[in-house]
């Protein structure tokens, strides 16, 4: 902390400005009235303060609002937001998607950061939901975002939101995550027509039932192997040889480079080899 | 509940062949799900698979013990069992059988017997 | 093969401590990777399944995540019973494969 001094004579700072970058930290303290920083913070961005500088601006708005900032004054942190701690961030109550991006912009290119995540979940609680426009903000800085919530949270995802899903947000989902987010997929695409329906709910299917997966079968879908291979297990191994068949279609052939691996593995196992060798692919259960 | 007993000799000579059995109770070898494995520990090493088999008779060996192993499976007793031919002092382990649902992992394992390989 | 390669091989902690394992895939696995538990003199025991999955009957504090070639064995708060060895495994590939181990003792 810095000792509390006086100002010196004519140091009194009127506004913030490039003036104060050749003040010391005690003289910053000590000249530079908190409330008007607070109400000029959009120019502490554009100069070029140290940062132990930084650190005696903290200083001064803790001490301003000691149970949190505004929203007024956090939307205008800049690179300040850096220098908070999850603690300091627990404190605010961010409601506004502008203050949001504003924040999130400052750690662009940066894995998710402790101070970061916790904002996102005080402006995600905030809400309620994660509704659409959120959900497109969050997943434009952070791609894997989406598969870092818990199934718990993301059942607070609303059918609506899923439109924003791309299938690269999916990426790192696991099983149990899936689980969650394809029930709400079918229910947001649910009114497209078989061959656009399965595009959209393509990326989604790593949490489909077995039932569903027969469907897709009926409809010449001609699912890639990349889509095969993240089914879930479970739903995988009561499919016959013919389904998988009519659901791979012209990819059928790729079952053979995958033997090795699960579900692949898991389902050529438990079927009969009759059955597997009218595929012609030298597959052995 | 399902519950897997290792029985078999405890010590085998170098150059012998290695036989072990595992009866499993309280459940059927001939499940759906689950595969059936052998899993061994050298004293103070790690875990290193052997090989499963599915009631089916199909079977898939660790790539570098599978000149030496066969695994197989008696539904009639319920059990399934492991020969390691060739045996040397570097074979000496715990040996332990494992049931595995195709969903999870390792679920249910023997308690584990030691077979020392010496003259 | 797919190697797994675990770190660190061991550590010391207190009772109430935060522990996190790693464990790392020469290649991808996807989401199968298990993790078990061993105290000496016993057969290992399932906690973690599919990467994330907590096994029936293992106390919340575990937790794993992870994909592709990254996982992590994560022990919110390291209780008296927890000190033992941990292992994780791929089931990916048709050749099943152990990391080294994680030996976790008391500090």
């Known amino acids: 902390e810095v000792e509390k001094t006086a100002c010196p004579s004519g140091k009194k700072a009127r506004e913030i400005d490039e003036s104060l970058i050749f003040y010391k930290k005690w003289e910053l303290e000590a000249c530079v009235d908190a409330a008007l920083l607070a109400t000029q913070m959009d120019r502490v961005n554009a100069i070029p303060f140290t940062y132990e500088q930084l650190d005696v601006l903290k200083h001064k708005l803790d001490e301003l609002y000691p149970q949190g900032y505004p929203e007024s004054v956090i939307q205008h942190l800049g690179y300040l937001f850096l220098k908070m701690s999850p603690e300091d961030i627990r404190k605010w109550n961010v409601t506004s998607l502008e203050t949001l991006k504003a924040l999130l912009e400052v750690n662009k290119g940066h894995e998710m950061s402790p101070q970061v995540a916790t904002l996102i979940d005080r402006f995600v609680k905030g809400r309620g939901q994660l509704d659409k426009d959120t959900l497109d903000t969050l997943t434009a800085f952070y791609p894997g975002y989406l598969c870092s919530l818990s199934p718990e949270e993301l059942s607070s995802v609303p059918p609506s939101s899923i439109w924003a899903v791309r299938p690269q947000d999916l990426d790192t989902c696991d099983p149990r995550q899936l689980d969650v987010l394809y029930p709400k997929a079918r229910l947001a695409f649910q009114n497209m027509n078989g061959s656009e329906y399965f595009v959209k709910i393509q990326s989604f299917l790593g949490g489909a039932p077995t039932e569903d997966l027969k469907a897709l079968s009926q409809q010449n879908v001609s699912m890639d192997l990349a889509t095969f291979m993240k089914l879930r297990t479970d739903a995988v191994l009561p499919l016959t040889v013919a389904e998988v068949q009519k659901l791979l279609g012209p990819h059928v052939e790729g079952l053979k480079a995958e033997e090795r691996h699960r579900p692949v593995r898991d389902w050529i196992l438990r079927q009969r080899q009759d059955d597997l060798d009218t595929l012609g692919l030298g597959l052995q259960g | 509940q399902v519950q897997l007993q290792e029985s078999g000799p405890g010590l085998v000579k170098p150059s012998e062949t290695l036989s072990l059995t595992c009866t499993v109770s309280g459940g059927s070898v001939s499940s759906y799900h689950d595969l059936w494995s052998w899993i061994r520990q050298p004293p103070g090493k790690g875990l290193e698979w052997i090989g499963y088999?599915?009631?089916?008779?199909?079977?898939n060996y660790n790539p570098s013990l599978k000149s030496r192993v066969t695994i197989s499976v008696d539904t009639s007793k319920n059990q399934f069992s492991l020969k390691l031919s060739s045996v040397t002092a570097a074979d000496t382990a715990v040996y332990y059988c494992a049931r595995e649902d195709a969903l999870t992992g390792f679920d249910i394992w023997g308690q584990g017997t030691m077979v020392t390989v010496s003259s | 093969d797919i190697q797994m390669t675990q770190s660190p091989s061991s550590l010391s902690a207190s009772v109430g401590d935060r522990v996190t394992i790693t464990c790392r895939a020469s290649?991808?696995?996807?989401?199968?990777v298990n993790w078990y538990q061993q105290k000496p003199g016993k057969a290992p025991k399932l906690l973690i399944y599919?990467?994330?999955s907590l096994q029936s009957g293992v106390p919340s504090r575990f937790s794993g995540s992870g994909s592709g070639t990254d996982f992590t064995l994560t022990i919110s708060s390291l209780q008296p019973e927890d000190f033992a060895t941990y292992y994780c495994?791929?089931?990916?590939?048709?050749?099943?494969?152990f990391g080294g181990g994680t030996k976790v003792e008391i500090k």
């Open positions: 599919a990467a994330s």
């Open positions: 290649q991808s696995s996807r989401y199968y």
């Open positions: 495994q791929q089931s990916y590939d048709a050749s099943y494969t």
């Open positions: 088999i599915y009631y089916s008779g199909s079977t």
